[in-house]
Interface confidence: low
């Protein structure tokens, strides 16, 4: 028999399971074709859908909430006590590994240190569903300047500034080898951007060149980075340089897969018991499963990748535990 439980009050926007260890789930999970409540009450009394199958929001036979196939091996199920709504931490699950998230523009940024000319760099960013970075605010530029783009243990010397291709070009408008000109956005689709200041200087140039490419130089000596020290250079587009890509934020699951709009997923981060819906590139309506303490183990560590799985650290204990609850099917 099921243990008595206190009177259940789910938050608005949540569905109350009739019984079982999971109590509250996000409302959109009701009648979505996947049973989430243990008693499957979220899929009961649903309106009939014409046609052979229910709409599954484009999902395959694998339930992205748990990453398991329906009717899969029950030993992979982890028992949970309660699924509670949580406020999702802003920095988790919005950018793939290696990309840095900035809330101000809902974008992800990544520096590529492989030297490429401007056009190859632009193509590389495009292949990654992004473009060479442009900036819409001073704050966005400051965020980029403040990042540690390579291995944190590396000690930076004075010359370890980053020279990065970014998404602007300098068009020469003056005649007779005058360097007067203007910055333009190099690629269409960059809306509401600010244009850089005049390039501090341009290196010796060929007489035929009338378009140069933007190189943002960030000085990465720790005491100087806090001064936002940087400079803008108009360089030959054929010079090889590191480059800065920018892409829209996106939902990223715990296995570093990009998740499409409307799908359920466990966000990248430090809580494998979190389940969310991807909406506008952000995890929304998240619920966190709470696990029972593993029996017969004093000291334990949670498995960072699997929900309700523990490593027992007791000298005489079994090493691996699943947290079993009495209501498990």
């Amino acid at each position: 028999t099921e243990p008595l439980r206190p009177e259940l009050r789910c938050n608005p926007g949540q569905f109350a399971c009739r019984s079982g260890t999971i109590q509250c789930i996000p409302l959109p999970w009701q009648c979505d074709g996947w049973a989430t409540c243990e008693d499957e009450s979220d899929e009961a009394n649903c309106p009939e859908v014409t046609g052979e199958v229910r709409p599954h929001h484009g999902k395959e036979a694998v339930d992205p909430r748990q990453g398991r196939a329906r009717g899969g091996d029950p030993s992979h199920f982890h028992a949970v006590n309660v699924a509670q709504p949580v406020r999702f931490s802003s920095f988790l699950g919005k950018c793939p590994t290696g990309w840095h998230h900035y809330e101000g523009t809902a974008s992800c940024y990544r520096v590529y240190l492989s030297g490429e000319n401007y056009w190859d760099a632009a193509q590389t960013c495009q292949r990654l569903n992004g473009s060479l970075a442009t900036f819409s605010t001073d704050q966005e530029l400051r965020f980029v300047l403040a990042q540690e783009w390579d291995q944190p243990e590396r000690s930076f010397g004075w010359k370890d500034q980053r020279k990065l291709w970014v998404g602007y070009q300098y068009v020469i408008t003056g005649r007779n080898r005058s360097l007067e000109g203007r910055w333009e956005v190099a690629f269409k689709g960059s809306s509401e951007v600010f244009l850089p200041p005049d390039p501090i200087f341009a290196s010796a140039m060929s007489e035929n060149d009338n378009v140069f490419c933007a190189q943002l130089q960030c000085f990465h000596f720790p005491t100087l980075r806090h001064h936002d020290l940087h400079s803008w250079h108009a360089e030959s587009c054929y010079e090889k340089s590191s480059f800065l890509c920018k892409r829209s934020q996106t939902c990223v699951d715990i296995k570093d897969n990009v998740v499409d709009e409307g799908f359920y997923f466990t966000p990248k981060g430090d809580d494998p018991c979190l389940s969310c819906t991807c909406h506008g590139g952000e995890p929304e309506m998240c619920v966190a499963a709470l696990c029972e303490r593993p029996q017969g183990c004093q000291q334990y560590r949670k498995d960072p990748k699997e929900c309700c799985k523990f490593m027992c650290l007791d000298p005489d204990g079994n090493s691996l535990f699943d947290s079993m609850a009495s209501g498990m099917r």
């Epitope: 001073d138 007067e180 005049d198 200087f201 001064h227 936002d228």
Partner: antibody, heavy 115, light 106 residues
């Protein structure tokens, strides 16, 4: 064409004040690092102060607390307010664009501090 | 604060190559710029970031920087190159100039 023109130099007594101006054309002062560099008669170059595009200001130890760098974006001009002047501040003062390197310089204005 | 040391004066015959040195502790870890200043004129940038030449500066000017020494080399020196030359770098001070080298073209 980029041009920097300094003015405001002259003879001043020790302890006195002077305000130097630097009118820029061909580029936007507020978008660039702008510095003052001085050169005492027959001596080498000495960096004095910088103002960043973001507005942060830095000074050489020798002038800290006495000199103030500023700019007027509407006039596209740079200024150096010099107070509590000393004999050792006597120099030609140049305004220059840049900070880690100076790619354009004005013609300079002579400041003489003497009683 | 960095201290940059230059030879006070050097002489060179026309069409010869001359090298002006600038030394400082671990200077090779920092970028160095070089300026030319003729009598009664403002300084002019001739080399930046160790070895890069701004547009308009003749190809006979070149630079390098490693270890504790940066060098400015003028190949095929001309009478018009007679001037004072200053090296410059930056650190937390933040800007430092060398004492200058008076180059005389004999």
């Amino acid at each position: 064409e980029v041009q920097l023109v300094e003015s405001g130099g002259g003879l001043v007594q020790p302890g006195g004040s002077l305000r130097l101006s630097c009118a820029a054309s061909g580029f936007t002062v507020s978008s660039n690092y702008m510095s003052w560099v001085r050169q005492a008669p027959g001596k080498g170059l000495e960096w004095v102060s910088v103002i960043y595009s973001g507005g942060s200001t830095y000074y050489a130890d020798s002038v800290k607390g006495r000199f103030t760098i500023s700019r007027d974006n509407a006039k596209n001009s740079l200024y150096l307010q010099m107070n509590s002047l000393r004999a050792e501040d006597t120099a030609v003062y140049y305004c220059a664009r840049g900070w880690t390197t100076f790619d354009y310089w004005g013609q300079g204005t002579l400041v003489t501090v003497s009683s | 604060q960095a201290v940059l040391t230059q030879p006070p004066s050097l002489s060179v015959s026309p069409r010869q190559t001359v090298t002006i040195t600038c030394s400082g502790d671990q200077l090779g870890d920092r970028y160095v710029s070089w300026y030319q200043q003729k009598p009664g004129q403002s300084p002019m940038l001739v080399i930046y970031q160790d070895d890069r030449r701004p547009s308009g500066v003749p190809e006979r000017f070149s630079g390098s920087n490693s270890g504790n020494t940066a060098t400015l080399t003028i190949g095929g020196t001309q009478a018009m190159d007679q001037a004072d030359y200053y090296c410059q770098t930056w650190d937390n001070s933040p800007v430092v100039f060398g004492g200058g080298t008076k180059l005389t073209v004999l």
